[in-house]
Structure formats: structure tokens, C-alpha cells
């Protein structure tokens, strides 16, 4: 069954290469386990960037991924991707799966275009 | 009479606050004078950023505007806006007017969304 997932259409990474954006789903269900996957779309190909399962006890996710972090609250996940460079500019999709209790629900956002600009190196200090 | 003006939908300013993009029009006319105006749209309001008239002798424009520069070649103008900061992020429209010889033609592009990220200041050198 499907749920609706919303995410911002555009986000600018900071000059440190950090991009943060919310991923929300509706209708909101009383859910024990919510799996969130961030995918990057390049051409017709989707590659997984990071994924985590939020549970009633574990509301901080992506502990296995150095470049992703996220917090979960009700039906909203605040995602942060760091270590971004200009070559990482692209469309990042948020996929949400309600894993427990059944029934299984899944939804995919339309994607957030993340723009990344590489900073100029600072001049060497003499 | 109307001409079609095309410009890219999105451009990222460099970390130095410089954004460059082309503005092209068609059909191409053999024209002595082409006036190009860059406008910024905020909400429902348009404000002029800079304007110049290119002639057969004068293919470098915006000499009166410190933040704009541009070169003209046939039916294409290469625009550069500098000194941009994050607050300048927005939609920039290119307006083209074929001034001479008559008939008068005018066209407006759909706008280029320029994204600007302020760089982090470099640490003070001791």
C-alpha cells in the first residue's frame, strides 16, 4: 500500500558540503518501525546513499553511515548529508517504508535537488 | 512583435559569488541594436538588475554596471553577474529587445534560478 512522501524540491549544501532537508509522510500511522532510504538518481539509475530503520526506541538513525544522519519524530525525518562536493550535485529521493506493524506501506518522494559548490581553498598562511 | 528567449533554468554561483549564463533569442535577425535587460523577480515584483545595448561595434556590454558584464555574438548573450551573496539567490530573467532596424521585437526568458551560498570566512593567518 502507498503513502505520500514529501520533501523540498531544492536544497543548497552549505560551503562545508552539508545539506539538510525534511522528509515527511502521510497519512501518519502509529508505527513501531519506519525504514528510511536516501537514493540518488542519476539518469535512469538509482543508487542507495544510506538507509536506516527508526524504531520506538531508536529515533536517531544512520549510525552505520558516516555521511548521513537523521532524526525521527512522528511522521517527519530530518535528514542531513555531509561530505558533499560539487560532483555530488543531483537529485536525492527519500523512500519511506512502514515496516511494523503490518500492513506494509511504502512511498517515495519526488526528490530534492541538492546543489553543491566547492569552496575556494583559503590562501596559505605565511 | 515577439521573439523567443531561452536561458537555463538553474545556475549555481561560484564560491566567489559569480554566476554566468547564456541568454539566446530566436528567430535570429540581422540586427544593428539589441538591448538586453536582466531583471530579478521577487514575489510578483520585477526589479532591474542591469541593462545594456549591444551594437555591431559594441559587443561588450554593461560597462556602467559594476556587477554585470556580458558579451554578444549573433543571437546569444553571455551574461555574468558578480558580487552575489546568499541573499541574492532568486530568479533572474533575461529580456531581449531588437531595437533597430524596425520592426521592434521583444521577448522575455522564463528566468534562471541563481543559487548563491556564502563562503565560510578563512581563518585569520597569524
Amino acid at each position: 500500500e502507498a503513502i505520500q512522501v514529501t520533501q523540498p524540491s531544492v536544497v543548497l549544501a552549505s560551503s562545508h558540503g552539508v545539506a539538510s532537508f525534511p522528509c515527511e509522510y502521510s497519512p501518519s500511522h502509529n508505527t513501531d518501525e519506519v525504514r528510511v532510504t536516501v537514493l540518488r538518481q542519476t539518469n535512469d539509475q538509482m543508487t542507495e546513499v544510506c538507509a536506516t530503520t527508526f524504531t520506538e526506541k531508536n529515533t536517531v538513525g544512520f549510525l552505520d553511515y558516516p555521511f548521513c544522519s537523521g532524526t525521527f519524530n512522528e511522521s517527519r525525518v530530518n535528514l542531513t548529508i555531509q561530505g558533499l562536493r560539487a560532483v555530488d550535485t543531483g537529485l536525492y529521493l527519500c523512500k519511506v517504508e512502514l515496516m511494523y506493524p503490518p500492513p506494509y506501506f511504502v512511498g517515495m518522494g519526488n526528490g530534492t535537488q541538492i546543489y553543491v559548490i566547492d569552496p575556494e581553498p583559503c590562501p596559505d598562511s605565511d | 512583435e515577439a521573439i523567443q528567449v531561452t536561458q537555463p533554468s538553474v545556475v549555481l554561483a561560484s564560491s566567489h559569488g559569480v554566476a554566468s549564463f547564456p541568454c539566446e533569442y530566436s528567430p535570429s535577425h540581422n540586427t544593428d541594436e539589441v538591448r538586453v535587460t536582466v531583471l530579478r523577480q521577487t514575489n510578483d515584483q520585477m526589479t532591474e538588475v542591469c541593462a545594456t545595448t549591444f551594437t555591431e561595434k559594441n559587443t561588450v556590454g554593461f560597462l556602467d554596471y559594476p556587477f554585470c558584464s556580458g558579451t554578444f555574438n549573433e543571437s546569444r548573450v553571455n551574461l555574468t553577474i558578480q558580487g552575489l551573496r546568499a541573499v541574492d539567490t532568486g530568479l533572474y530573467l533575461c529580456k531581449v529587445e531588437l531595437m533597430y532596424p524596425p520592426p521592434y521585437f521583444v521577448g522575455m526568458g522564463n528566468g534562471t534560478q541563481i543559487y548563491v551560498i556564502d563562503p565560510e570566512p578563512c581563518p585569520d593567518s597569524d
Epitope: D32, M99, Y100, P102 | -
Partner: antibody
């Protein structure tokens, strides 16, 4: 060895109460959803109740809702089923079963470990 | 609730025979179906999960297939130790429901 051992069954009069226990060993108890499934004599299997790994969420079949309470004590690796207002139709062998691992990356649940069962007889 | 209908309710076959049991769901359950074996006086044992995946340690003569509403459980070559009752179970939604069981006997 992964094991579940139930206890607490017995003969009880209609309207009475009973508490079943299920002690788990050989796995991280708090990392699994746990279930109770029953089987009336000579009949098929009927799912009764489920509880999340932390005990924060509970689920019941309509036939027992409001009468039975599932709970767990993760410090004791023990699952419970408190049965009140018992009826003759609650007579069955009650099994505890291990369900889904919390945080599993795919949807789905199967009862891969079962206890030996404990018989509850409701009769006057 | 989702109804699970198994057929036949019982069957008798010879050692070495191919045995097939079907399970029909009252609505689409995708591949969210498990199969269990229960021997007399014992607890059920998981054989197949997610309609077609063999549980670790279960002999390869057991298999499952199907999706949607129609599912099949097969024993490719019946062995004496396979005498038991077999149940299908859906996990699409609570309450989880089981088929009424199929009793397999040796001729």
C-alpha cells in the same frame, strides 16, 4: 541453543484468571517481537497477541481484546500473557513464538522459534 | 480479517510421491505467506517464509511458490518423517491468520 519455555497453564473456572510465562534463552530477547499463538484441542492454529521489542506496542486478536494482556520483562528475558475473564473457548495449548527482529531491513515476519506449549483448560 | 483456505484438508500418499498443498487467501497478500509443519504433540516448525524461501536447516524437498492470492506448498519426494499437519499463514496484516491445516499421511 535458542529456546522458549512456557509455563503457567492449568485448569481454571470460567471467569477466572491465569498468567502464562515464556522464558527465552540463546538470543537477544529485546531485539525481537514476541507472539502468543494458541491451538484448541484437535483444531488449527490461532494467533492471539504480539508485543514489540521494548514492550511499548501491543497487538491483540479481537477474540481476546480487553481480556488478555501481553507484556514482557526484558531484564528477565520473559514474555507474559495475563488472561482474565476466561471462557470455555479459550481452552487451548498456548505457544509463545519469536517473531520479527527489530530493525530488520525488509518487511515480513515468521515464527521461527516456538516454545513447547502450555495447556490452559477452562472448565467448571 | 483475511481468510486462508487450505486444500485438501487431508491426503494420503506413498513414500517418494510428490505432494502438493494449496492455500488461497481471501485477498491479495503479495508474497507475505509462511508455511509450517506440526507433528502430533509438538510445536509448529517454520519451513518456508515469504512464500518461497526455505528456512535454514529445512530439507530441500520442501518448496513453496505463489503470489497474490494463490500459493502452493510441495514435498517433492515424501518421506516417512514428513507425516504431519501443514499450515499456511499470512502476515500481511493483523490479525495473522492460518489455514485450517492439511494432514499428510502415508499410504
Amino acid at each position: 541453543e535458542v529456546q522458549l519455555v512456557e509455563s503457567g497453564g492449568g485448569l481454571v473456572q470460567p471467569g477466572g484468571s491465569l498468567r502464562l510465562s515464556c522464558v527465552a534463552s540463546g538470543f537477544t530477547f529485546s531485539s525481537y517481537y514476541m507472539h502468543w499463538v494458541r491451538q484448541a484441542p484437535g483444531k488449527g492454529l490461532e494467533w492471539v497477541s504480539a508485543i514489540s521489542g521494548s514492550g511499548g506496542s501491543t497487538y491483540y486478536a479481537d477474540s481476546v481484546k480487553g481480556r488478555f494482556t501481553i507484556s514482557r520483562d526484558n531484564s528477565k528475558n520473559t514474555l507474559y500473557l495475563q488472561m482474565n475473564s476466561l471462557r470455555a473457548e479459550d481452552t487451548a495449548v498456548y505457544y509463545c513464538a519469536r517473531g520479527r527482529q527489530v530493525g530488520k531491513s525488509s518487511f515480513g515476519e515468521a515464527f521461527d522459534v516456538w516454545g513447547q506449549g502450555t495447556l490452559v483448560t477452562v472448565s467448571s | 480479517d483475511i481468510q486462508m483456505t487450505q486444500s485438501p484438508s487431508s491426503l494420503s500418499a506413498s513414500v517418494g510421491d510428490r505432494v502438493t498443498i494449496t492455500c488461497q487467501a481471501s485477498q491479495d497478500i503479495s508474497n507475505y505467506l509462511n508455511w509450517y509443519q506440526q507433528k502430533p504433540g509438538k510445536a509448529p516448525k517454520l519451513l518456508i517464509y515469504d512464500a518461497s524461501n526455505l528456512e535454514t536447516g529445512v530439507p530441500s524437498r520442501f518448496s513453496g511458490s505463489g503470489s497474490g492470492t494463490d500459493f502452493t506448498f510441495t514435498i517433492s519426494s515424501l518421506q516417512p518423517e514428513d507425516i504431519a499437519t501443514y499450515y499456511c499463514q499470512q502476515f500481511t496484516s493483523f490479525p495473522y491468520t492460518f489455514g485450517q491445516g492439511t494432514k499428510v499421511e502415508i499410504k
